[in-house]
C-alpha cells in the first residue's frame, strides 16, 4: 500500500530472469515501467494485466524461452500498443534462437520439450505427531541437463538450511528426459515446524513451483484427571472427573455401558460443565448403575478411561 | 575394498518374519541408492526393491509391496530388508546391489546400473 | 510374466562373436537406460555394460551393447570359456516409482 500512485518505475539492470504472475501487484497505476538490462527468459501470462495505465513498457532480452508459455505476449503487447520499447529475441528452442517474438508465427510458440522443469509428483499435505520423522517429496521432469537446483519454502520463506535430499534418474527417449526429486526431512517435529511447505525447482530457464502442502503437528490425547469408581445411595448427586490435553484441544466425550442412550441422559439428568472437568447426575437412580466411560479425541486419536457407578438404594 | 556382506538369511515358516542386513565398506555409503535383488533356485534374477541415497525415496516389486520393508542406517553403513508375511514363493538368493550415483553438488544422479554385488544370503521359507 | 524377453540359450564356439537380444516395450527399453551382468553359476552377478553402452572399469571391449527401440543387444567377440555364464538386461519399467525388471536371462555355452 502506498505505491498504487506510482506513475513510473525503473528496474533496469537487476538480474531480472523471470516475470510472476503478480510480481507488480499493488502498482495498478504504473504508466512507464522500465525492465531493460534484464535476461528476461519468461514472463507469466497476463503479468501486466491489472496496469490499465500502462504507456510505455520497456524490454531488451534476447535470452527469451519461445515456449507455449510466451504465446501470449507478442498479441498482448500488439494490442496494448507496447511493442515500440520491447525488443524481445528467442534463445531457445533452437529452431526459434534470435528471431523477435513478434516474427514468430504463433503456431510456433509449443512446448514440445520442457526445459523449465515440471512438476510431477507433488507435496502432500501431512499429519504427523510431535516428536516424528515427516518428509516431503517432490519431482520434476525436464527435457534440459542444464544444472538444477532445489530449494524448499516454509510459509513463502526459503528454507536456508534445510535438510534435504536430491537426486535424479534419467530416462532415455528420444534425447534425455531428467526426472528430479527433491525430498525434504523434517526430523523430531514441533509446533514449531506447522506450516505450508512448497519446494522450488530451477534451473537456466526458469524455476517451478509446487504446490503448498501443509503439515499439522499433533499431540494423542493424555488425561489430565480420570474419573474413578463411586459408590452413592439413590437420589443424590453423582460426581465424575475427566479432562485430558492435547493438540488439537480433545473433546471430552462420555459413554454408559458403552452406549451413549442411557438413562441420565435421556432424562436430562445429565449435566456437563462447559468450561468444567466434571460431569454430574443428579437424582441418581437404581438404573444409572454401570461402568462410565470418558472418551478424549482429537484428530491424532482418541484415548478411553473407565469408573464404575454403584447405586445403593436409600 | 569396496564391499557388501548380506546376512539375516534362514530358514522360517510361512507368514513369519525374517530381517536381512546388508553391511557396506570401502565407499561412501551415503553417496549411493541401494537394492535388493533375489533369485529363487533355479530361477532368474528378480528385482526387489530399492532405497534412495538418504533414504526418503523407497520403491517395491508388486510382489512384494505392503509385505517388504527397506531401510538404511547411514551412520552404520547398512541396508536392511524386513520381510513380514512370508510366503513360500519368496524362497531365494537374497543380493544387495549398490546402484551406481554420481553425487555432484548435493545432487545425486542415479544411473541404470548396479556395480556392487554382496555374496547374497538363502531365505528359505516353507513348514 | 517377464516383462523383457531374451532367448533361454545361445551357443558359439570359442573366438566367435554371439548376440545376445532383449526385447521390451516403449515403456521400459523404449523409455529408459538398459544394462547387463553376467552370472557365472554359483556367483553373484557381475555389472556388464550400463546406460546403454558404458562398460564398468575392468570390463573387457570383446562386451559392448546397443539399443534400438524398444529392443536392445549384447555383443561378445572374440569368446572364452570362461565366457560361459548366465546373461541378464535390465531396466526401468516406466518411471522410477515403478521399479526395475530384469529379462528372464539367456544361458551361453561355449562348445
Known amino acids: 500500500s502506498g505505491l498504487d500512485s506510482l506513475s513510473k518505475l525503473t528496474l533496469f539492470g537487476n538480474k531480472i530472469k523471470s516475470v510472476a504472475k503478480r510480481a507488480f501487484s499493488g502498482l495498478e497505476g504504473l504508466e512507464h515501467l522500465n525492465l531493460g538490462g534484464n535476461a528476461i527468459r519468461s514472463v507469466q501470462f497476463d503479468a501486466f494485466v491489472k496496469m490499465k495505465n500502462l504507456k510505455e513498457l520497456h524490454i531488451s532480452s534476447d535470452s527469451f524461452l519461445c515456449d507455449c508459455q510466451l504465446k501470449w505476449l507478442p498479441p498482448w503487447l500488439i494490442g496494448r500498443m507496447l511493442q515500440a520499447f520491447v525488443t524481445a529475441t528467442c534463445a531457445h528452442p533452437e529452431s526459434l534462437k534470435g528471431q523477435s517474438i513478434f516474427s514468430v508465427p504463433p503456431e510456433s510458440f509449443v512446448c514440445d520439450d520442457f526445459l523449465k522443469p515440471q512438476i510431477i509428483t507433488q507435496p502432500e499435505t501431512t499429519m504427523a505427531m510431535v516428536g516424528k520423522d515427516i518428509r516431503f517429496t517432490c519431482s520434476a521432469a525436464s527435457s534440459s541437463s542444464s544444472p538444477m537446483t532445489f530449494a524448499w519454502k516454509k510459509d513463502n520463506e526459503v528454507l536456508t538450511n534445510a535438510d534435504m535430499e536430491n537426486f535424479v534418474h534419467v530416462h532415455a527417449q528420444d534425447g534425455e528426459v531428467m526426472e528430479y526429486t527433491t525430498i525434504l526431512h523434517l526430523r523430531q517435529v514441533t509446533f514449531g515446524h506447522e506450516g505450508r511447505y512448497q519446494c522450488v525447482i530451477t534451473n537456466h530457464f526458469g524455476s517451478t513451483y509446487s504446490h503448498k502442502a501443509r503439515l499439522t503437528v499433533n499431540v494423542l490425547p493424555s488425561f489430565t484427571k480420570t474419573p474413578h469408581d463411586i459408590t452413592i445411595r439413590t437420589t443424590t448427586m453423582a460426581r465424575l472427573e475427566c479432562a485430558a490435553t492435547g493438540h488439537p484441544n480433545p473433546q471430552i466425550a462420555w459413554q454408559k455401558d458403552g452406549g451413549t442412550d442411557f438413562p441420565a441422559a435421556r432424562e436430562r439428568r445429565m449435566h456437563v460443565m462447559p468450561d468444567d472437568d466434571v460431569f454430574f447426575i443428579t437424582d441418581v437412580k437404581i438404573d444409572d448403575a454401570g461402568v462410565y466411560s470418558c472418551t478424549a479425541q482429537n484428530s491424532a486419536g482418541s484415548i478411553s478411561a473407565n469408573a464404575t457407578l454403584t447405586v445403593l438404594e436409600t | 575394498e569396496v564391499q557388501l556382506l548380506e546376512s539375516g538369511g534362514g530358514l522360517v515358516q510361512p507368514g513369519g518374519s525374517l530381517r536381512l542386513s546388508c553391511a557396506a565398506s570401502?565407499?561412501?555409503?551415503?553417496?549411493?541408492?541401494m537394492s535388493w535383488v533375489r533369485q529363487a533356485p533355479g530361477k532368474g534374477l528378480e528385482w526387489v526393491s530399492v532405497?534412495?541415497?538418504?533414504?526418503?525415496?523407497?520403491y517395491y516389486a508388486d510382489s512384494v509391496k505392503g509385505r517388504f520393508t527397506i531401510s538404511r542406517d547411514n551412520s552404520k553403513n547398512t541396508l536392511y530388508l524386513q520381510m513380514n508375511s512370508l510366503r513360500a514363493e519368496d524362497t531365494a538368493v537374497y543380493y544387495c546391489?549398490?546402484?551406481?550415483?554420481?553425487?555432484?553438488?548435493?545432487?545425486?544422479?542415479?544411473?541404470?546400473?548396479?556395480?556392487?554385488w554382496g555374496q547374497g544370503t538363502l531365505v528359505t521359507v516353507s513348514s | 510374466q517377464l516383462v523383457l524377453t531374451q532367448p533361454p540359450s545361445v551357443s558359439a564356439a570359442p573366438g566367435q562373436r554371439v548376440s545376445i537380444s532383449c526385447s521390451g516395450s516403449s515403456s521400459n527399453i523404449g523409455d529408459n537406460y538398459v544394462s547387463w551382468y553376467q552370472q557365472v553359476p554359483g556367483s553373484a552377478p557381475k555389472l556388464l555394460i550400463y546406460?546403454?553402452?558404458k562398460r564398468p572399469s575392468g570390463i573387457p571391449d570383446r562386451f559392448s551393447a546397443s539399443k534400438s527401440g524398444t529392443s536392445a543387444t549384447l555383443g561378445i567377440t572374440g569368446l572364452q570359456t570362461g565366457d560361459e555364464a548366465d546373461y541378464y538386461c535390465?531396466?526401468?519399467?516406466?518411471?522410477?516409482?515403478?521399479?526395475?525388471?530384469f529379462g528372464g536371462g539367456t544361458k551361453l555355452t561355449v562348445l
Open positions: 546391489a549398490r546402484v551406481i550415483s554420481n553425487c555432484h553438488l548435493g545432487v545425486c544422479y542415479y544411473s541404470n546400473g548396479m556395480d556392487v
Open positions: 546406460d546403454n553402452n
Open positions: 535390465a531396466t526401468w519399467d516406466g518411471s522410477l516409482s515403478a521399479g526395475r525388471v
Open positions: 570401502g565407499f561412501t555409503f551415503s553417496n549411493y541408492a
Open positions: 532405497i534412495s541415497h538418504g533414504g526418503g525415496s523407497t
